[in-house]
């Protein structure tokens, strides 16, 4: 079996994860994908997922999540915005691709929000702080339910410094509550 | 082999702004992360900002917000920053420096691997 | 905002010694650190990414290690070359930030 690796971040409540998921254009572009949380021992659970067919550079916010497809640079972009301490825990991008299994983007992510506002967010208020206050229109999402039983994850060995998934429920909005955010100037 | 060319040397005067250019050759400019890191004569290196250009949006050090502005022209691969309200203190040379895009998360994994030439610009009455 | 601690903030040393130079973050940055050498009048130059990494074209007697908070930059054979000034970086939330540099100096 493939080893799946992981890269950690550490970072303080009221931060901002920002990461970036890449994927062979050829075969993904227009593919609908997805930011999922792995729990040890359970499925992963979809948090949010772009439109299908994933529209390029078109941001879909669930809560406190934001992603971005960028089409012509096999880029799928992740935020977090206002990071708390629950939000601790292993995540990954996916890509839809029925009747197949979601196809996993390579690395996956173990997040550890400690306590302390460090003072700035992760982006700055000046840059796309801003943008999370505008009035949202929602719609419904399309995030397909199914997951397949080969996803089931048998969670990697932790290190002493990790952090585990909490029990709690990340704190979002309901899922099916998409919101469109405008294209940053 | 990528190449990142800065614009030449400015003198400006207090109070003034000054836009320094960085032209990125041989490579991926749009995905990459590009920051502006400044030294001032004697002292250690400070990070001013950066910014992904197909993202569009800049981050910014504290100390430089409202003051620094950031953009990045994809059609030329050109990056720029522009400081403004300029002080003695602000004299310093100027660097731009890229991260290229990794197949990591993490915008920044490799570092900041390509650096700019430098800027000088000093700040005088 | 991290802050990034350099120790010593000089040395000296003799060709062929072996040079140990290190760096705290005030905060874990899991690896998200890099490693920058500076000569006088010239651009800094990436040694190591992703705290143990080495930068292609870098010569093999540099090396990092640690993660968390505590890093480590080691020249195993000081080199002419290598009189220089070294700089830290972490890279695992904006801002980014840098250590306040450590002149190596010949003896």
């Known amino acids: 079996a493939t080893k799946l690796t992981e890269e950690k971040y550490e970072l303080k409540e009221g931060q901002t994860l920002d990461v970036k998921c890449d994927y062979t254009l050829e075969k993904f572009a227009s593919s609908q994908k997805a930011w999922q949380i792995i729990r040890d021992g359970e499925m992963p659970k979809t948090l949010a997922c772009t439109e299908r067919p994933s529209k390029n550079s078109h941001p879909v916010q669930v809560g406190r999540i934001i992603l971005e497809d960028y089409h012509d640079h096999g880029l799928l972009r992740v935020r977090m915005v206002n990071l708390q301490v629950e939000d601790s825990g292993l995540y990954q991008c996916v890509i839809y691709q029925p009747p197949k299994e979601p196809h996993m983007l390579f690395d996956r992510i173990r997040l550890v929000v400690t306590k302390g506002f460090s003072g700035t967010p992760g982006s700055n208020e000046n840059s796309t702080q801003n943008v999370y206050k505008i009035p949202p229109t929602t719609t419904k999402a399309l995030c397909p339910l199914y997951t397949s039983p080969r996803t089931v994850t048998q969670a990697p060995p932790k290190s002493t410094a990790d952090v585990s998934t909490p029990d709690s429920e990340i704190n979002l909005t309901n899922v099916t509550d998409i919101i469109r955010v405008p294209v940053f100037n | 082999q990528v190449q990142l060319v800065q614009s030449g040397a400015e003198v400006k005067k207090p109070g003034s702004s000054v836009k320094v250019s960085c032209k990125a050759s041989?490579?991926?400019?749009?995905?990459?992360?590009i920051s502006w890191v400044r030294q001032a004569p004697g002292q250690g290196l400070e990070w001013m900002g950066g910014i992904i250009p197909i993202f569009g949006t800049a981050n910014y050090a504290q100390k430089f917000q409202g003051r620094v502005t950031i953009t990045a022209d994809e059609s030329t691969s050109t990056a720029y920053m522009e400081l403004s309200s300029l002080r003695s203190e602000d004299t310093a040379v100027y660097y731009c420096?890229?991260?290229?895009?990794?197949?990591?998360?993490?915008?920044?994994?490799?570092?900041?691997?390509?650096w700019g030439q430098g800027t000088t610009v000093t700040v005088s009455s | 905002d991290i802050q990034m601690t350099q120790s010593p903030t000089s040395l000296s040393a003799s060709v062929g010694d072996r040079v140990t130079i290190t760096c705290r973050a005030s905060?874990?940055?899991?690896?998200?650190l890099a490693w920058y050498q500076q000569k006088p009048e010239k651009a800094p130059k990436s040694l190591i990414y992703?705290?143990?990494s080495l930068q292609s074209g870098v010569p093999s007697r540099f090396s990092g290690s640690g993660s968390g908070t505590d890093f480590t930059l080691t020249i195993s054979s000081l080199q002419p070359e290598d009189f220089a000034t070294y700089y830290c970086?972490?890279?695992?939330?904006?801002?980014?930030?840098f250590g306040g540099g450590t002149k190596v100096e010949i003896k």
């Open positions: 041989g490579g991926t400019f749009s995905s990459s992360a």
């Open positions: 420096a890229r991260a290229s895009q990794s197949r990591s998360s993490n915008y920044y994994y490799y570092g900041l691997d390509v």
């Open positions: 992703a705290a143990s």
């Open positions: 970086q972490q890279y695992n939330s904006y801002p980014l930030t």
């Open positions: 905060q874990g940055i899991s690896s998200w």
